[in-house]
Interface confidence: low
């Protein structure tokens, strides 16, 4: 177990052009606070994945009012460290997100007026017990300077806070089976630390913080003997040797208290003593209130103003999670039809439609030919959100406005010569060929492969293409 500590040194405009406007004004004074979110490992986790190592909110900073005309200075910061306790081993590599929030002042009865100013993130290696590490991160035009460290809570030591150490009982050496605690050679590796007060004679533990009783003893600290005379012990299977009940599973076995709460047995059940910040039968409810600003991304906090009334965050569209910390990728549902481009604007979804489609979700297929005239006798053909013109002979182009050169495509086969004509083209065929495009050879015996030529035309004459 241990604590990750974060010290914010400054938050203000970064170097370079484009200094940000002050987030506070004479009309709207405000103050800053910070949120840190820690995750184990160096993986590129999404910003919305849970803060598995823990999270913390700072206190509110002093009230700040912008001086008119003055550039935004470094803004006044909250006092103190942000502390994120961790119960298990320190992972050594971790990801962090630090958010700078603005609280607008006023009687916010109807809901919070908080807005996210900047979010920085990074991945770092850090050994517990080491010195403070300094860092500078930029978010847009803002710059955040901070230091951080991880320290173990006694009796844990080591770079991962997994070894338990105690001062030596004897000056020269550690007890039987116990090694010195490097690098603290004056301390010794300690045996497992049972729950405070656990009877050394009648109790033992297999996990730190527990207290399991030897046969014949009961109670949260194994200090209560099981009666062998009246045999009225309220629980446990009967012992064949004594004919009496011996302690079976107790209500505190397995520690039903969450979030570091300690369990004590009561005549009927158990009772959890919760650490500060938690409450509920099993310490399962965070004592954070709306005053602590637990809802992010413009979420609305509702619930009582006192820790006995749990809060709930109402998330704006595009966000979800118990604290509105998760961004919903609403475009992944592919709401835009007909190939429209989806834009998630945060407050709304927008679809940018392809030509020929319209509507909030591009669901309407427009009449592509509506209002589109094809010139020179061309006809409009719809298709796939675009129109095209099928042009009359002798015309071309998108709207049939261009005069076509009918000979440009070399339409006359077998060396025939092409002549442009007001109604199209005429092919003058080379000897031995005939047809509108000179496509048919004339048989050597003088007969054509076609039916007889119309009157007045001999094979080999120019065939006019109508």
């Amino acid at each position: 177990a241990g604590v990750f500590e974060l010290q914010i040194h400054s938050f203000g405009p970064g170097p370079g052009p484009g200094a940000p406007r002050s987030p506070c004004s004479a009309r709207l004074p405000c103050r800053l606070f910070f949120r840190v979110c820690l995750k184990p490992g160096l993986s590129e986790e999404a910003a919305e994945s849970p803060c598995a190592l823990g999270a913390a909110l700072s206190a509110r900073g002093p009230v700040y009012t912008e001086q008119p005309g003055a550039p935004a200075p470094d803004l006044p910061l909250p006092d103190g460290l942000l502390q994120v306790p961790f119960r298990d081993a320190w992972p050594g590599t971790f990801s962090f997100i630090i958010e700078t929030w603005r609280e607008e002042l006023g009687d916010q009865i109807g809901g919070p007026a908080w807005s996210l100013l900047a979010r920085v993130a990074g991945r770092r290696r850090l050994a517990a017990g080491g010195p403070w590490a300094r860092d500078i991160q930029r978010a847009g035009a803002w710059e955040l300077r901070f230091s951080y460290r991880a320290r173990c809570e006694p009796p844990a030591v080591g770079t991962a806070c997994t070894r338990l150490c105690r001062p030596r009982s004897a000056p020269s050496r550690c007890g039987p089976g116990l090694r010195p605690c490097a690098p603290l050679e004056d301390e010794c590796e300690a045996p497992l630390v049972c729950r405070a007060g656990c009877s050394p004679e009648h109790g033992f533990c297999e996990q730190p913080g527990e207290c399991r009783c030897l046969e014949g003893w009961t109670g949260p600290l194994c200090t209560v003997p099981v009666s062998t005379s009246s045999c009225l012990s309220p629980r446990g299977p009967s012992s064949a040797t004594t004919g009496c009940l011996v302690p079976g599973p107790g209500p505190c076995d397995g520690n039903p208290c969450a979030n570091g709460g300690s369990c004590s047995e009561t005549p009927r059940s158990f009772e959890c003593t919760c650490p500060r910040g938690f409450y509920g039968l099993r310490c399962e409810v965070s004592g954070v209130t709306c005053a602590d600003g637990p809802c992010f991304n413009g979420g609305l906090c509702v619930g009582g103003a006192d820790p006995d009334s749990a809060y709930i965050c109402h998330c704006p569209p595009g966000f979800q999670g118990s604290n509105c910390e998760k961004r919903v990728d609403r475009c992944s549902l592919q709401p835009c039809r007909n190939g429209g481009l989806c834009l998630d604007l945060g407050h709304a979804l927008r679809c940018r439609c392809r030509a020929g489609f319209a509507g909030p979700r591009c669901e309407h297929d427009l009449d592509d030919c509506a209002g589109r005239a094809c010139a020179n006798g061309g006809t409009c053909v719809e298709g796939g959100g675009a129109h095209r013109c099928s042009c009359a002979l002798g015309f071309g182009g998108r709207d049939c406005r261009e005069r076509a050169d009918p000979c440009a495509a070399r339409p006359c086969a077998h060396g025939g010569r092409c002549y442009a004509h007001f109604s199209g083209l005429v092919c003058a065929c080379a000897p031995g060929y005939m047809g509108a495009r000179c496509e048919f050879p004339v048989h050597p015996d003088g007969a054509s492969a076609l039916p007889a030529a119309p009157p007045g035309l001999r094979p080999g004459d120019p065939q006019r293409y109508l």
Epitope: D107, G110, A113, L300, V302
Partner: antibody, heavy 118, light 107 residues
Framework: QVQLQQPGAELVKPGTSVKLSCEAS????????MQWVRQRPGQGLEWIGM????????NYNENFQTKATLTVDKSSSTAYMQLSSLTSEDSAVYYC???????????WGQGTSVTVSS | DIQMTQTTSSLSVSLGDRVTINCSAS??????LNWYQQKPDGTVKLLIY???NLHSGVPSRFSGSGSGTDYSLTISNLEPEDIATYYC?????????FGGGTKLEIK
């Protein structure tokens, strides 16, 4: 005392827009969310959306996202809802309501009856 | 979206009756439930917030209870001015939704 004043009725043509108003008095307008609720004839209540005047933050029911636009004028302590591309389906009574703690709408306007008809 | 269901759309009642109106949610809403009264002239008033808390100025004959998905509004001694339609509304997540309403009618 807290009051929310809404005009009694609006008659509008299909395809047009209408901007409904809700004038607040008796409390600090900027600090409370203003909610809007629809009630079609003979039907129940439907939540449209909400706006927090001091920051212009809005939250919409997605069913109304393209239909309604919420705005405020802090100088006159008035909330507005614009309804666009009106059809007969939009004929209804539209209420504004102040939201207090626990997301409870503790004070309601009298409602504006919108009739869409050519 | 969470559906709120008021199974009884109308109730025939007598003055002095003890009346219970039920409301069920399609999923747990953690007591995030309010009750409203709508008079025949369209006027809407808040009665109960957060399942069981009486709004200021509301007579003590109104009470609310419930948990999980099932909630109820009770009027212990029905008065003439209580003839109205009653709506439940959840606020456990967006969008807020209302029940379909329960209309009280004199027998």
């Amino acid at each position: 005392q807290v009051q929310l004043q809404q005009p009694g009725a609006e008659l509008v043509k299909p395809g047009t827009s209408v901007k409904l108003s809700c004038e607040a008095s008796g409390y600090t307008f900027s600090n409370y969310w203003m909610q809007w609720v629809r009630q079609r004839p003979g039907q129940g209540l439907e939540w449209i959306g909400m706006i927090l005047p001091n920051s212009d933050i809005t939250n919409y029911n997605e069913n109304f996202q393209t239909k309604a636009t919420l705005t405020v004028d802090k100088s006159s302590s008035t909330a507005y809802m614009q309804l666009s591309s009106l059809t007969s389906e939009d004929s209804a009574v539209y209420y504004c309501a102040r939201q207090a703690r626990y997301s409870a709408m503790d004070y309601w306007g009298q409602g504006t009856s919108v009739t869409v008809s050519s | 979206d969470i559906q709120m269901t008021q199974t009884t759309s109308s109730l025939s009642v007598s003055l002095g009756d003890r009346v219970t109106i039920n409301c069920s949610a399609s999923q747990g809403i953690s007591n995030y439930l309010n009750w409203y009264q709508q008079k025949p002239d369209g006027t809407v008033k808040l009665l109960i917030y957060y399942t069981s808390n009486l709004h200021s100025g509301v007579p003590s004959r109104f009470s609310g209870s419930g948990s999980g998905t099932d909630y109820s509004l009770t009027i212990s001694n029905l008065e003439p001015e209580d003839i109205a339609t009653y709506y439940c509304q959840h606020y456990s997540k967006f969008p807020y939704t209302f029940g379909g309403g329960t209309k009280l009618e004199i027998k």
